[in-house]
Amino acid sequence: TPEVWVQVQMEATELSSFTVHCGFLGPGSISLVTVSWGGPDGAGGTKLAVLHPELGTRQWAPARQARWETQSSISLALEDSGASSPFANTTFCCKFASFPEGSWESCGSLPPSSDPGLSAPPTPVPILRADL
């Protein structure tokens, strides 16, 4: 069964900068990736970026740069303008769509104990169902 992993890390040099890494483990080529925060897109979450392998990327503040890392993984850099660093408690969700297989989605957040610069382990937070 395909899976999606989500990893959130705080930059060591700049505590207001965060990076979300997402990857798809499974067969099929990715047609679209949607990244949201505050929950899944369509379920109260806010869209941060949409990445298409051929047509490029579209992003919305506070997303700074969305890019493909491999054919099945992406990264999204975020700039936190607020002093209170709200990203630390935020859930980030990534949805990978593969045709004709379908979509897989998972969410993750920065672990409370994580030190700046240390990446969170890729442990997806299941939403609604374990295979979502």
């Epitope: 080529s29 899944p40 369509g42 979509s103």
Partner: antibody
């Protein structure tokens, strides 16, 4: 204007074969996933077969696996459905449809359909 | 495969009425739901994608809502030209599956 025109349907004997074609125009055919959807006499819609833009992946409805083959010729802007060992339950109106990545793979354009009738 | 149960099968309404059609998925389909309109003698046409987004040229009297397993499609102020069969469809997991359709008739 996006246009999808199906052809190749007709009356065929039980166990016979047919090849449906769908001529696409008005868009970059090679960039889109395509599928064949049929509408049964009871007006139910079923996704019969689908193929992605780069021809890497295909999907078939369980009841047509091993009998139907979906293919595409991106140079000719044409989608095909080779149907063999036809059964009476394959009688339907067959549509070709385009899938839009940015619309969650919704089928944003459909052809007018071509009718397939399997008789005993 | 995911079953999309659409209700009601038939609707008889007067012009100006508000119409609601529901679709229930047998498992979560996220927000990957589309709605189609099929007028007599025509092929289906896309109305809504990602549950609530109207396709190009679709009037704003058509709206959609829901997430996960329960979805609603509404026509505010039905017009005579809305006479058609309406289908929901999930594109979350292969095989994409359709609801059984709702035939809308105008009194």
């Amino acid at each position: 204007d996006v246009k999808l025109v199906e052809s190749g349907g007709g009356l065929v004997k039980l166990g016979g074969s047919l090849k449906l074609s769908c001529a696409a125009s008005g868009f970059t055919f090679s960039s889109y996933h395509m599928s064949w959807v049929r509408q049964t006499p009871e007006k139910r819609l079923e996704l019969v077969a689908a193929i992605n833009s780069n021809v890497i992946s295909t999907y078939y409805l369980d009841t047509v696996k091993g009998r139907f083959t979906i293919s595409r010729d991106n140079a000719k802007n044409t989608l095909y459905l080779q149907m063999s060992s036809l059964k009476s339950e394959d009688t339907a109106l067959y549509y070709c449809a385009r899938h839009e990545d940015y619309y969650g793979f919704a089928m944003d354009y459909w052809g007018q359909g071509t009718s397939v009738t399997v008789s005993s | 495969s995911i079953v999309m149960t659409q209700t009601p099968k038939f609707l008889l309404v007067s012009a100006g009425d508000r119409v609601t059609i529901t679709c229930k998925a047998s498992q979560s389909v996220s927000n990957d739901v589309a709605w189609y309109q099929q007028k007599p003698g025509q092929s289906p046409k896309l109305l809504m994608y990602y549950v609530s987004n109207r396709f190009t040229g679709v009037p704003d009297r058509f709206t959609g809502s829901g997430y996960g397993t329960d979805f609603t499609f509404t026509i505010n102020t039905v017009q005579a030209e809305d006479l058609a069969v309406y289908f929901c469809q999930q594109a979350y997991r292969s095989p994409w599956t359709f609801g059984g359709g709702t035939k809308l008739e105008i009194k």
